[in-house]
């Protein structure tokens, strides 16, 4: 913490200018008044600040406002946001998307996931949905962000909104997240054609269960083998050799480089052998011909 | 080792079909499918398409669809692909690889279509 | 269908020197899952058919020099030579297996000087 000094008169500040670059660490303490420096935050990006001097107006405005920045500071914060914490952000209240575009420019090139994180979840609250503008916002300025909202926020997501959300924006979701957007999709491309509806769904698919996967396996679809392997494992593993050649279509062939990586492998571990040579990949690890399989789960559920 | 026999040229006039072979040996011929490429002179590579040689199933490029056939036999590991309707477009060499990675390619047959 | 663009489309270097060669895709090859990049690199030598040297960007093919070296990710893909032979003057193709239909590069031509 900066230890309080009494300003001298001459150092006194009037306006946010390129003298304070001066100023000792201890001066700009003393000397800028906390309320003056929330009046002239739209100065303070202009001036090249050291990373120190920053830290002290950090600190004159948390001693401000305690419970959080209004929005008209945050707005203006520039590369003051490189200094701010996801426990900072928390507090905060964001609703403009200016507020957004500009703190995302500001955070760009620097290793400030979580802060991004926190501040997009703010946006969200602060603006009661994740709308199309936001939306938009996010792919625009910032590629793979969506992802970083919890699947909580994501439910909030309409799906009329779900058409601006572009593959590259969902190659950071996980299972959790997938698992809310893909119903979303689904409902959102519904009236689309079979080729043109798994273009537009692929991305999503990581949600999908395993009737829907059984049901594109019937459509000549061709999936990709990356798409295939980020489809949820328990949506895998009841497919029949016939349903993953029909999904696959030529790609099948890739399963072969693939067979140490699930689901796969989980996969290929539930098959029957003579089925599996019918790829004509010379895949091993099937259940060996005259064996039977007992399913105990069943058993023990039913005693 | 590893190898796919192709025979070194074709000679056929135009609107005439042909039928390449590809005799793989050196390998279980039915744990890796067969892809068959196209290289016009001076030119870059084309997939044309691929076949499973355990099953018969077969996947073309669009472009090949109505001009390319593949089809196996197993009891002598040798794989086909028949060009039909053929003119001067289709002079080029056809090689035919194995598998995913095409490890493996034969030395490739040099189709010649003139009258 | 995914665009490879492959620069310079031919190159002319002395024996020793170093050879670098572009591929660049329309679209990712990764595969997040797995980590693999569905690229592979092929050199033609005159009068010859393709041969593998690299798979997975970056995997070399049983049997190939050291001095062949496959990198990149997603939509740019490099080949280095490292100290060139005589024996490499060859067509260099990318192609990639992530989709079909399965496409090439057009090629870089290395001549030696």
């Known amino acids: 913490d900066v230890e309080r000094t009494t300003c001298p008169p001459e150092k006194e500040v009037h306006e946010i200018d390129e003298s304070l670059i001066f100023y000792k660490k201890r001066e700009l303490e003393a000397c800028v008044d906390a309320a003056l420096l929330a009046a002239q935050m739209d100065r303070v990006d202009a001036i090249p600040f050291t990373y120190e001097q920053l830290d002290v107006l950090k600190h004159k405005l948390d001693e401000l406002y305690p419970q959080g920045y209004p929005e008209s500071v945050i707005r203006h914060l520039g590369h003051l946001f490189l200094k701010m914490s996801p426990e900072d952000i928390r507090k905060w209240n964001v609703t403009s998307l200016e507020t957004l575009k500009a703190l995302l420019k500001v955070s760009k090139g620097h290793e400030m996931s979580a802060q991004v994180a926190t501040l997009i979840d703010r946006v969200v609250v602060g603006r009661g949905q994740l709308d199309k503008d936001t939306v938009d916002t996010l792919t625009a300025f910032c590629p793979g962000c969506l992802c970083s909202l919890s699947p909580e926020r994501l439910s909030s997501v309409p799906p009329s909104v779900i058409g601006a959300v572009r593959p590259q924006d969902l190659d950071t979701c996980g299972p959790r997240q997938l698992d809310v957007l893909y119903p979303k999709a689904r409902l959102a491309f519904q009236n689309m054609s079979g080729s043109e509806y798994f273009v537009k769904i692929r991305p999503f698919l990581g949600g999908a269960p395993t009737e829907d996967v059984k049901a594109l396996s019937q459509q000549n679809v061709s999936m990709d083998l990356a798409t295939f392997m980020k489809l949820r494992r328990e949506a895998v593993l009841p497919l029949t050799v016939a349903e993953v050649q029909k999904l696959l279509g030529p790609h099948v062939e890739g399963l072969k480089v693939e067979e140490q990586h699930s689901p796969v492998r989980d996969w290929i571990l539930k098959q029957r052998q003579d089925d599996l040579d019918t790829l004509g990949l010379g895949l091993q690890g099937g259940i060996p011909n005259g064996y039977l399989i007992l399913d105990l789960s069943v058993r023990e559920a039913l005693s | 080792q590893v190898q796919l026999q192709q025979p070194g040229t074709e000679l056929v006039t135009p609107g005439a079909s042909v039928k390449l072979s590809c005799k793989a040996s050196?390998?279980?011929?039915?744990?890796?499918?067969m892809h068959w490429v196209k290289q016009r002179p001076g030119q870059g590579l084309e997939w044309i398409g691929n076949?499973?040689?355990?099953?018969?199933?077969?996947f073309y490029n669009e472009k090949f669809k109505n001009k390319a056939t593949l089809t196996v036999d197993k009891s002598s590991s040798t794989a086909y692909m028949q060009l039909s309707s053929l003119t001067s477009e289709d002079s080029a060499v056809y090689y035919c690889?194995?598998?995913?990675?095409?490890?493996?390619w034969g030395q490739g047959t040099t189709l010649t279509v003139s009258s | 269908d995914i665009v490879m663009t492959q620069s310079p489309s031919s190159l002319a270097v002395s024996v020793g020197q170093k050879v670098t060669m572009s591929c660049k895709s329309s679209?990712?090859?990764?595969?997040?899952?797995?980590?693999?990049?569905?690229l592979a690199w092929y050199q033609q030598k005159p009068g010859q058919s393709p041969k593998l040297l690299v798979y997975?960007?970056?995997t070399k093919d049983s049997g190939v020099p050291d001095r062949f070296i496959g990198s990149g990710s997603g939509t740019d893909f490099t080949l280095t030579i490292n100290s060139v032979q005589a024996e490499d003057l060859a067509d260099y193709f990318c192609?990639?297996?992530?989709?079909?239909?399965?496409?090439f590069g057009g090629g870089t031509k290395l001549e030696i000087k």
């Open positions: 997975f960007a970056s």
């Open positions: 192609q990639q297996h992530y989709t079909t239909p399965y496409t």
């Open positions: 076949i499973n040689p355990s099953n018969g199933d077969t």
């Open positions: 679209q990712s090859l990764l595969n997040s899952s797995s980590q693999k990049n569905y």
């Open positions: 050196g390998y279980s011929f039915t744990s890796y499918w």
């Open positions: 690889a194995r598998g995913w990675l095409r490890d493996y």
